[in-house]
């Protein structure tokens, strides 16, 4: 019994069969976060919950110290939410002193750190300006897509004002990634 | 020739090989929907079609009244999309008796139902503060994520307020599953 | 040895056991488009990067002319995200002529093309009214689905106007496909 | 040396609202939450809510139709107002700064406590 | 939102003596968002102990915590006279909550 002949008959098998239910997985969900001063530029990563409730690592992926590492090379579909919520937002207007933070903008990038490579790369962004003329505003962006990545890559979700995270429920913000 | 042949070498294969086409999937597209008073803090399911057009449920998958049921445990890639639409939102502003139907927020949550438990589970939440200083306003609202699921598991999606649903076509409201 | 003692014990396995490894998938994405003149009612085809950055195909998916060639028949997770970018927006003021382009409204389709078929199909959508008072906006529309498709067939991902997208860089916009 | 200190009103009637002030000396104001606490005379301790300086707040579920948290960067202040007070309202609220690092969070720093009495 | 129980409701005990304070969650709680407070009669809660295991700035040695998921304990090795008070467990999670407190009295 060879194991092509359980490939389709137009085609050689080049990669072993392997059991789906063994594939590295992981689902993260939103925690507390500090609350940092926004800096122009600098985007700082979340950090994630991997174990309480709807948070799983399974088969290797690991989550450790803001990142998801990648245990095995392949092509992986990796996927983020993260809600935002702030008072009303800038549009435009001159930013007056001692008043809260007024984004024009929100953004959230999917990033990929290699080590033996020095600039991290940006898979996915999802960046909205903000111009709410009511009082208090909230709103999801919502990334996901399918990359080749290698064994010891990182990933990491960066936003571009940590203050502005919705932290209150695991359901809102949220970060994933799973072999195919 | 012993199934571990077919795993990569270093791990042990521990669930039984599997063809692809064989796993619980669906694809479920919007119907038009029974309008129901809009209630706070209810959220209303949405009901489907499951065989028309795009729509189709399959390998055990099945759906019956407004559920998703889950026929196998594993992990479960969920998403959904939710088109909605209205007229001039609230925007802070002092609602006014009579007036059509002026959203302040718009949400979407996917809600996992399990029997032996008694309070569903949030899964997903997508949930935007609407604020259109524009007559008409129409948007969509997407999530999609991993969830380990049970057996038995049921899966639903609840917007905030049935009658903004956009209904009119099915690649605009959506909801599926699929078994990885 | 037969193929179905790698099955669950309850189910026959009806398709082969196929290597993971070895499935079609491409992830496309932005380039610098052909600016083109906006048609009401006609949706341009976005094209796109294959093999350079973080783009590939695999696997005997094949990307030619703005299309994404599906080279075998079965269930396929298909995603794009563009992001869009334009100055203030109508807002249901008169248009002015002569004024820069100033949409009330941002769409994306991915559409399905099937020779012997004479009209394509719309699997998904995403739409949203544009009515943002600052002066410059940008926001993205995040789409992806499940669906059952047929070799040969072949998907495009379209939008309401060409000149809005954003194609400065590969994580903002793109398309993407993979068989399950 | 971080130093919380509370002010406002101590005696109030029924249906009136609550406004206490904490200044914040000696500390950055980015960087943590500031939190609002009350303690029924003889009872526990109950987190009324949160706001960081950007002014995004979090509030407890069961008091959130009535409390409004506000930030003032400029002045290195916050504020509590909560609407609708009846005796059950009345008790020693306090403000506290809320400390997270990495994924450690804790109250580290308190107020002296404020008694507001409501009664007609 | 996270209930905590905390027992014993009350303590009778000499000064020299070891006490451990129970704390127990409705659900799993991170480790490192369970903390200890000690509220002398008339002042403010004071922080002693942190991500369920480590000691505040300032608190001796005396006082240590333990526990994870859903079961915390507080331990004090010899209690000195000015430990008498009411102690309170503590998590904070997106909607922070404490325990309904343990007061600790002379014998």
């Known amino acids: 019994l060879k194991g092509q002949e359980f490939a389709p008959s137009h085609q050689q098998v080049y990669a072993p069969l392997r059991a789906d239910g063994d594939k590295p997985r992981a689902h993260l969900t939103v925690v507390r976060q500090t609350p940092t001063q926004h800096l122009k530029n600098q985007f700082p990563a979340l950090h994630w919950e991997h174990e309480l409730g709807l948070a799983f690592t399974k088969n290797r992926m690991n989550y450790t110290n803001k990142f998801l590492l990648i245990p095995e090379s392949g092509d992986y579909f990796v996927y983020s939410q993260v809600t935002f919520r702030g008072m009303t937002s800038e549009c435009s207007e001159i930013r007056q002193a001692g008043r809260p933070n007024k984004p024009d903008s929100i953004t959230v990038v999917i990033t990929k750190v290699t080590d033996s490579y020095p600039e991290p790369t940006q898979l996915l962004m999802g960046t909205k300006s903000v111009c709410e003329v009511g009082s208090n505003w909230f709103q999801p962006i919502y990334l996901g897509a399918m990359f080749s990545l290698q064994e010891g890559d990182k990933l990491m979700v960066n936003v571009s004002d940590i203050s502005l995270v919705d932290y209150t429920k695991e359901d809102k913000t949220f970060f994933g990634a799973f072999l195919l | 020739l012993k199934g571990q042949e077919f795993a990569p070498s270093h791990q042990q294969v521990y669930a039984p090989l599997r063809a692809d086409g064989d796993k619980p999937r669906a694809h479920l597209t919007v119907v038009r929907q029974t309008p129901t008073q809009h209630l706070k803090n209810q959220f209303p399911a949405l009901h489907w079609e499951h065989e028309l057009g795009l729509a189709f449920t399959k390998n055990r998958m099945n759906y019956t009244n407004k559920f998703l049921l889950i026929p196998e445990s594993g992990d479960y890639f969920v998403y959904s999309q939710v088109t909605f639409r209205g007229m001039t939102s609230e925007c802070s502003e002092i609602r006014q008796a009579g007036r059509p139907n002026k959203p302040d927020s718009i949400t979407v949550v996917i809600t996992k139902v399990t029997d032996s438990y008694p309070e569903p589970t949030q899964l997903l939440m997508g949930t935007k503060s609407v604020c259109e200083v524009g007559s008409n306003w129409f948007q969509p609202i997407y999530l999609g994520a991993m969830f380990s699921l049970q057996e038995g598991d049921k899966l639903m999606v609840n917007v905030s307020d049935i009658s903004l649903v956009d209904y009119t076509k099915e690649d605009k409201t959506f909801f599926g599953a699929f078994l990885l | 040895l037969k193929g179905q003692e790698f099955a669950p014990s309850h189910q026959q396995v009806y398709a082969p056991l196929r290597a993971d490894g070895d499935k079609p998938r491409a992830h496309l994405t932005v380039v610098r488009q052909t600016p083109t003149q906006h048609l009401k009612n006609q949706f341009p085809a976005l094209h796109w990067e294959h093999e350079l950055g973080l783009a590939f195909t695999k696997n005997r998916m094949n990307y030619t002319n703005k299309f994404l060639l599906i080279p075998e028949s079965g269930d396929y997770f298909v995603y794009s995200q563009v992001t869009f970018r334009g100055m203030t927006s109508e807002c249901s003021e008169i248009r002015q002529a002569g004024r820069p382009n100033k949409p009330d409204s941002i769409t994306v389709v991915i559409t399905k093309v099937t020779d012997s078929y004479p009209e394509p199909t719309q699997l998904l959508m995403g739409t949203k009214s544009v009515c943002e008072v600052g002066s410059n906006w940008f926001q993205p529309i995040y789409l992806g689905a499940m669906f059952s498709l047929q070799e040969g067939d072949k998907l495009m991902v379209n939008v309401s106007d060409i000149s809005l997208v954003d194609y400065t860089k590969e994580d903002k916009t793109f398309f993407g496909a993979f068989l399950l | 040396q971080v130093q919380l200190q509370q002010w406002g009103a101590g005696l109030l009637k029924p249906s009136e609202t609550l406004s206490l002030t904490c200044d914040v000396y000696?500390?950055?104001?980015?960087?943590?939450?500031w939190n609002w606490i009350r303690q029924p005379p003889g009872k526990g301790l109950e987190w009324i809510g949160e706001i960081n300086h950007s002014g995004i707040t979090n509030y407890n579920p069961s008091l959130k139709s009535r409390v409004t948290i506000s930030v003032d960067t400029s002045k290195n202040q916050f504020s509590l107002k909560l609407s609708s007070v009846t005796a059950a309202d009345t008790a020693v609220y306090y403000c506290?700064?809320?400390?997270?690092?990495?994924?450690?969070?804790?109250?580290?720093?308190w107020g002296q406590g404020t008694l507001v009495t409501v009664s007609s | 939102e996270i209930v905590l129980t905390q027992s014993p409701g009350t303590l009778s005990l000499s000064p020299g003596e070891r006490v451990t304070l129970s704390c127990r969650a409705s659900?799993?709680?991170?480790?490192?968002?369970l903390a200890w407070y000690q509220q002398r009669a008339g002042q403010a809660p004071r922080l002693l102990i942190y991500g369920a295991s480590s000691r505040a700035t300032g608190i001796p040695d005396r006082f240590s915590g333990s526990g994870s998921g859903t079961d915390f304990t507080l331990t004090i090795s010899r209690l000195e006279p000015e430990d008498f008070a009411v102690y309170y467990c503590?998590?904070?999670?997106?909607?922070?909550?404490f325990g309904q407190g343990t007061r600790l009295e002379i014998k």
């Open positions: 659900q799993s709680v991170r480790s490192s968002y």
């Open positions: 506290a700064r809320g400390y997270c690092r990495s994924t450690t969070c804790y109250f580290d720093y």
């Open positions: 503590q998590q904070y999670g997106s909607s922070p909550t």
């Open positions: 000696g500390g950055s104001f980015s960087g943590y939450y």
